[in-house]
């Protein structure tokens, strides 16, 4: 369907002389210009009532006829004024002008809401010429309009670097309620109030909003958009929409779902992902939020030897990145870890236990009684120690790292040896005569190397010397035993 | 909704602003306009403020009233009071951008110009 | 700008029957014209506009026509609640012409 949109006032002669024939639609035009290339033509209405062009933007031309008589001021004449149409409805209208034959390139471009329209608009330029005058008549149409299409159309006329404007032409789509703002899914807390909104527009208006709940509405009366719904409070999920009216008809929102925040769910598939002497690195999946962020979580230990006194280790951490390294724990020892998070509600239950393992330690004491002494016939020097009392944890001694140090005339030279766990002394050569050997022995388990016993030191003389007393590890307090010989 | 404020007494000269406060719709999407309406008289349109905030007048308006917009708000001024500017003052919601007929209007506020 | 003349300024009819208010325009508007009904004491009420489209909630006994400079407005199956002072407006490229209107036409029921 289309509406057409007739031109209330036909071409009336602006001009002093015969204006033959008025405008009807079985006229052809004689020259007939399409606005843009390539648009299909739009029909042409005829002008049913007689009128007189308006007063509003003219352009008094400065040129004279034949009889030197002064043109007239230009104006477009009288448009429809307001055109009320549905939306996917066709639409033409037009604007219509009357210029003396002396003015050759008359343009007359079409305007929306203060910008031109350019492209892909169906408009159409259309000449009646005359003796004297030229009746122009542009006209414009929209095949299926929008609500994009409302608003105010004018025409302009560039003539002789005037410009002539025609009063406006509004364009009223009217159509089903259009939603602005509609409700949002929300999470709230249980008993609490809390407001949705609904706004719809015209044209037409005004837009009238009903609520529904759960397929039922909620206000017998409808509200004036747009509406704020206040629930007191809910105690279960529930869906949320709200229906604008119009006197075009009826548009629903979207569905909402309002849902009752809880405490989350516990996490699940704790797993280790690394683990040492003393920390374990720990992962989990976390488990329904309850309609609340997660804030953070409780990584709870407890030592699963059926010994211990049972008590629980807490550490607490962020609820992301889902992952934590449990610090300060025992080497090669057993525990049960379980996590649980929480929101603004509560705590989550604890995950499932799982059971985790340290490995083992490196040795926590170092070789005790460490005794050097100088064998100078074979040019060795002994070392003797006691074994450290070794934990269980610290696992099973694989052996020794012995660190002999030479120092001679600001030279400096550190060797390491290693020793197998049986025995407990070893001998190396004299690197060097005349300087300071220092050692240092410390245990060696799988889980690593222990710390090193106090430094001894011997001075190896030159050679010629005799057998010299035994350096041992110093008593406490005395820090750097040297065998003065 | 359209509600108007700020209509009082005063004395010829003063210079009065009044507000139209708008809600539900935006004024970047309407027009507003303003009419008066004297003691036991008719409608008489002052202007129109359209969505872009360009200002049309009645012919007898022009110089007397100023019409302006914020966000939420529209005022009309007027610049020089005179008694006969003694009426109840309507702002009104356009039916576009710029479209002058006016479907929703507010209660109305009266202005009393006396010396 | 365009000058809106209303008649008659008053008007009896008794309940039940029609009344037609009559709004001339010193220059051809199209059809951009509003009717608005208005109260004692109470803010105008949109009727019609583009001179013959009913606003929303306005009974069907309300009707508009004309285009060009003359206009009506008919109440048919006149109510007591219709009784009230109706408004002509022009409202035709408002930019140039202004937005006037009519004096005014009160209805009186019987």
């Known amino acids: 369907a289309i509406t057409e949109a007739r031109e209330e006032a036909k071409p009336y002669p602006l001009f002093p002389g015969p204006f033959p024939g008025s405008l009807q639609t079985d006229h052809t035009p004689l020259l007939s210009l399409p606005h843009a290339s390539g648009y299909q033509p739009a029909l042409m209405f005829s002008p049913t009532q007689p009128g007189r062009p308006h007063t509003g933007n003219v352009a008094i031309p400065q040129v004279t006829s034949v009889e030197s008589k002064p043109l007239p001021p230009l104006a477009f004449k009288h448009t429809v004024g307001h055109i009320i149409l549905s939306e996917h409805k066709g639409v033409k209208f037009n604007c219509s002008i009357s210029v003396p034959n002396i003015y050759q390139d008359t343009t007359i471009s079409w305007w929306k809401d203060g910008k031109e329209l350019l492209g892909a608009h169906h408009a159409i330029t259309q000449f009646y010429p005359d003796d004297e005058v030229t009746a122009i008549i542009a006209s414009f149409s929209i095949t299926s309009v929008q609500r994009s299409d409302n608003g105010s159309y004018i025409c302009k006329m560039k003539i002789n670097n005037e410009e002539i404007v025609s009063d406006p032409i509004y364009i009223e789509v009217q159509g089903l309620p259009h939603f602005t703002k509609q409700p949002e899914s929300m999470n709230v807390t249980r008993n609490t109030a809390f407001n949705l909104t609904c706004q719809a527009v015209g044209p037409p208006e005004p837009v009238n909003i009903f609520w529904v709940q759960n397929s039922s509405r909620v206000n017998e009366q409808p509200e004036k958009s747009p509406s704020v719904l206040t629930v007191p409070g809910l105690t279960e999920m529930a869906v949320f929409s709200c229906e604008a009216h119009n006197d075009k008809g009826l548009t629903v929102s979207k569905g909402v779902q309002i849902n009752i925040k809880a405490i989350p769910s516990p996490p699940t598939e704790v797993s280790i992902r690394n683990s040492t002497a003393h920390s374990i690195l720990i992962s989990w999946v976390p488990g329904f939020d309850g309609y609340s962020p997660f804030r953070n979580c409780s990584i709870q230990v407890k030592e699963a030897d059926p010994l211990s006194n049972g008590s629980v280790m807490i550490f607490n951490t962020s609820a992301l990145p889902h992952l934590y390294q449990i610090k300060q724990l025992q080497a090669l020892a057993n525990y049960s870890i379980g996590v649980s998070c929480m929101n603004e509600i509560g705590w989550s239950a604890v995950s499932p236990w799982i059971l985790a393992s340290t490995t083992e330690g490196a040795p926590s004491v170092a070789p005790l009684n460490v005794t050097v002494f100088l064998n100078e016939s074979s040019d060795n020097v002994d070392i003797r120690w006691m074994k450290p009392p070794t934990k269980q944890q610290d696992g099973e001694l694989v052996g020794y790292r012995i660190s002999h140090v030479w120092q001679s005339a600001g030279i400096s030279k550190e060797l390491l040896e290693e020793v197998g766990q049986n025995g407990s002394r070893a001998r190396i050569s004299v690197q060097v005569h005349n300087a300071t050997c220092t050692v240092r022995i410390a245990a060696v388990t799988r889980g690593g190397v222990g710390p090193f016993s106090d430094p001894v030191k011997i001075f190896i003389p030159a050679h010629g010397w005799v057998d010299y007393a035994p350096s041992s590890t110093p008593a406490p307090g005395n820090a750097d035993p040297v065998l003065i010989i | 909704s359209v509600e108007e404020s700020g209509g009082r007494l005063v004395t010829p000269g003063t210079p009065l602003t009044v507000t139209c406060t708008v809600s539900?719709?935006?004024?970047?999407?309407?027009?507003m306009g303003w009419v008066r309406q004297a003691p036991g008289k008719g409608l008489e349109y002052i202007g129109f403020?359209?969505?872009?905030?360009n200002t049309y007048y009645a012919s007898w308006a022009k110089g007397r009233f100023t019409i302006s917009k914020t966000s939420t708000t529209v005022d009309l001024k007027i610049t020089s009071p005179t008694t006969e500017d003694t009426a109840t003052y309507f702002c009104?919601?356009?039916?576009?951008?710029?479209?002058?007929?006016?479907?929703?209007w507010g209660p109305g506020t009266l202005v009393t110009v006396s010396l | 700008d365009v000058v809106m003349t209303q008649t008659p300024a008053s008007v009896e009819a008794a309940v039940g029957g029609t009344v037609t208010i009559k709004c001339q325009a010193s220059?051809?508007?199209?059809?951009?014209l509003a009717w608005y009904q208005q109260k004692p004491g109470q803010r105008p009420k949109l009727l019609i506009y583009?001179?013959?489209n009913l606003a929303s909630g306005v009974p069907s006994r309300f009707a508009g026509s004309g285009s060009g400079t003359q206009f009506t407005l008919t109440i048919s199956d006149l109510e007591c609640a219709d009784a009230a002072t109706y408004y002509c407006?022009?409202?035709?490229?408002?930019?140039?012409?202004?937005?006037?209107f009519g004096g005014g036409t009160e209805v009186v029921v019987k």
């Open positions: 220059q051809s508007i199209g059809n951009a």
């Open positions: 407006q022009t409202y035709y490229a408002i930019n140039r012409y202004g937005g006037a």
């Open positions: 539900g719709f935006s004024l970047s999407v309407y027009g």
């Open positions: 403020i359209n969505n872009v905030g």
């Open positions: 009104a919601k356009g039916g576009g951008g710029d479209w002058g007929y006016f479907n929703i």
């Open positions: 583009a001179a013959s």
